[in-house]
């Protein structure tokens, strides 16, 4: 085992030097010291070591810092950041925005989305603020990473970031995340009026409450069926047929193609069939006429 071999006489390096390129892997394992590497990260990045050699160095650093790298080392990582895993990053404590931006620059275009996201999450966890500069530094990474942050981390995300979020970015968000992001979006777009407001907020409507949707239905927004399908079931089922008619406007006809799929199906189950019949779309699955519905939330109690 490489660990058991002793460093050959005269081979102990006192600094990171080019001669290390020509060490055999077992010699690097036996001779190189993690604290020396940490002190001279700039040289580790400059000297053309192979992936294999760099992974030995990483193993050395991991052994030297089993609790995670200190910020003084993280600041110096440079291109070595590419050899670090998201799991490693979760152990870090990063407080400097400059460190984050420097490492995000390194990760750009390197298929390192997971590391970049982990780094930002770790920074937010330490009380840092995700500013627009940082979002720009995250570059082409879809903002779906917002859904990976803990709800606490999300509180640190400024509302202004909501302007950059696209419809697909929130597809994998939990209900709790959507609720928080919706609140942020509301405050981000508070000075936007009319249809422009709806265009911006519709990405976040999966986090809207029944009260918010009712208010929205008063504004002739003509919501498309794709947005309607993203609404949370709990909010949707609280809307009456008249309210949904107002919300969808001419797009109401698209309900027919979705009647057997959630959340449209869930909404239909809660409407009186006579109200659905008035729409003239042939929608089925409502509460039969003359029935009384008592909702004791039995299903929730046993789920």
């Amino acid at each position: 085992d490489a660990e058991q071999k002793a460093c050959p006489p005269g081979k102990e390096p006192y600094k990171v030097d080019e001669d290390l390129i020509f060490y055999q892997n077992w010699e690097l394992e036996a001779c190189v010291d993690g604290t020396m590497l940490a002190r001279q990260m700039d040289l580790v990045n400059e000297i053309p070591f192979t992936y294999e050699q760099l992974s030995i160095f990483k193993h050395k650093l991991d052994k030297t810092y089993p609790q995670g790298y200190p910020e003084s080392l993280i600041q110096q990582l440079g291109h070595f950041f590419r050899y670090v895993s998201p799991e490693d990053i979760h152990q870090w404590n990063v407080t400097s925005p400059d460190t984050v931006k420097t490492l995000l620059k390194v990760s750009k275009g390197q298929k390192m989305n997971a590391q970049a996201i982990a780094l930002v999450a770790c920074y937010l966890r330490g009380g840092g603020q995700l500013d627009e500069d940082m979002v720009k530094a995250l570059g082409d990474i879809p903002l779906s990473y917002l859904c990976d942050f803990s709800p606490q981390d999300l509180h640190s995300v400024p509302s202004s970031v909501m302007w950059l979020v696209g419809p697909q970015d929130l597809d994998k968000c939990s209900q709790r995340h959507l609720g928080l992001l919706y609140q942020k979006a509301c405050s981000a777009f508070q000075n936007v009026s009319g249809l422009e407001y709806f265009e911006k907020i519709k990405t976040f409507l999966g986090g809207a409450s029944v009260k918010d949707l009712r208010a929205l239905s008063q504004h002739n927004v003509s919501m498309d069926i794709a947005t309607f399908k993203r609404l949370q079931v709990d909010s949707l089922v609280g809307l009456s047929v008249a309210e949904v008619q107002k919300l969808l406007g001419p797009n109401i006809v698209d309900l027919k193609t979705e009647e057997d799929k959630s959340p449209v199906r869930d909404w239909l189950f809660r409407q009186h069939q006579k109200d659905l019949d008035r729409l003239g779309l042939g929608l089925q699955g409502g509460i039969p006429n003359g029935y009384l519905v008592l909702d004791f939330n039995v299903r929730e109690a046993f789920s």
Epitope: D19, I21, E46, P48, H79
Partner: antibody, heavy 115, light 112 residues
Framework: QVQLVQSGAEVKKPGSSVKVSCKAS????????FSWVRQAPGQGLEWMGG????????NYAQKFQGRVTITADESTSTAYMELSSLRSEDTAVYYC????????WGQGTLVTVSS | DIALTQPASVSGSPGQSITISCTGT?????????VSWYQQHPGKAPKLMIY???KRPSGVSNRFSGSKSGNTASLTISGLQAEDEADYYC???????????FGGGTKLTVLG
């Protein structure tokens, strides 16, 4: 101030050998990588091989394998490049350079191979 | 074998910016950050201008900058000056032969 000073120009006959020296001053010698690069008239740069004086073992570009020998003398901080079986297409300026990044270069040695 | 491709020539007027590209593959330029750039004036030894993709040695003007995107490294010279007219070579480290590989070189002409 780091300086690499190379030996003077040489005129050689085809089939013979040439040995060019490169004396380093103003910096550590043993742990650095020293390369030899050549440039034929009007052509680009071509890496030939290199050595870490501390270890003494050199590595070579495939093209020159068997024909080039790179050595180093730690006591005089000098690297050497010997090229054998010379042919006319070996006419070039030969440079030594320090470190893998080649941060310092010698002034170059013109080797002319002509019958 | 590694091959780095550079344009044979580029030109620009004084004050302008020019960019010289150096294209390799994902296992050399794209995979590592060991790209260097050298300037060579006629009859002179090459001079290191950029190393590790984007680092400038002390004494090199900040008009010279290096970057990399995917498998292509670039050298940008801003505020072009007459003395920038020279040949420029990119190079990377070839781990298979443990040595340096150079691009074919680019002749920069400063018009004027």
């Amino acid at each position: 101030q780091v300086q690499l000073v190379q030996s003077g120009a040489e005129v050689k006959k085809p089939g013979s050998s040439v040995k060019v020296s490169c004396k380093a001053s103003g910096g550590t010698f043993s742990s650095y990588y020293f390369s030899w690069v050549r440039q034929a008239p009007g052509q680009g740069l071509e890496w030939m091989g290199g050595i870490i004086p501390k270890f003494g073992s050199a590595n070579y570009a495939q093209k020159f394998q068997g024909r080039v020998t790179i050595t180093a003398d730690e006591s005089t901080s000098t690297a050497y490049m010997e090229l054998s079986s010379l042919r006319s297409e070996d006419t070039a300026v030969y440079y030594c350079a320090r470190r893998t990044s080649m941060d310092y270069w010698g002034q170059g040695t013109l080797v002319t191979v002509s019958s | 074998d590694i091959a780095l491709t550079q344009p044979a020539s580029v030109s620009g007027s004084p004050g302008q910016s020019i960019t010289i590209s150096c294209t390799g593959t994902s296992s050399d330029v794209g995979g590592y950050n060991y790209v260097s750039w050298y300037q060579q004036h006629p009859g002179k030894a090459p001079k290191l201008m950029i190393y590790s993709v984007s680092k400038r040695p002390s004494g090199v003007s900040n008009r010279f900058s290096g970057s990399k995107s995917g498998n292509t490294a670039s050298l940008t010279i801003s505020g072009l000056q007459a003395e920038d007219e020279a040949d420029y070579y990119c190079a990377t480290w070839d781990h298979s032969q443990m040595g340096k590989v150079f691009g074919g070189g680019t002749k920069l002409t400063v018009l004027g």
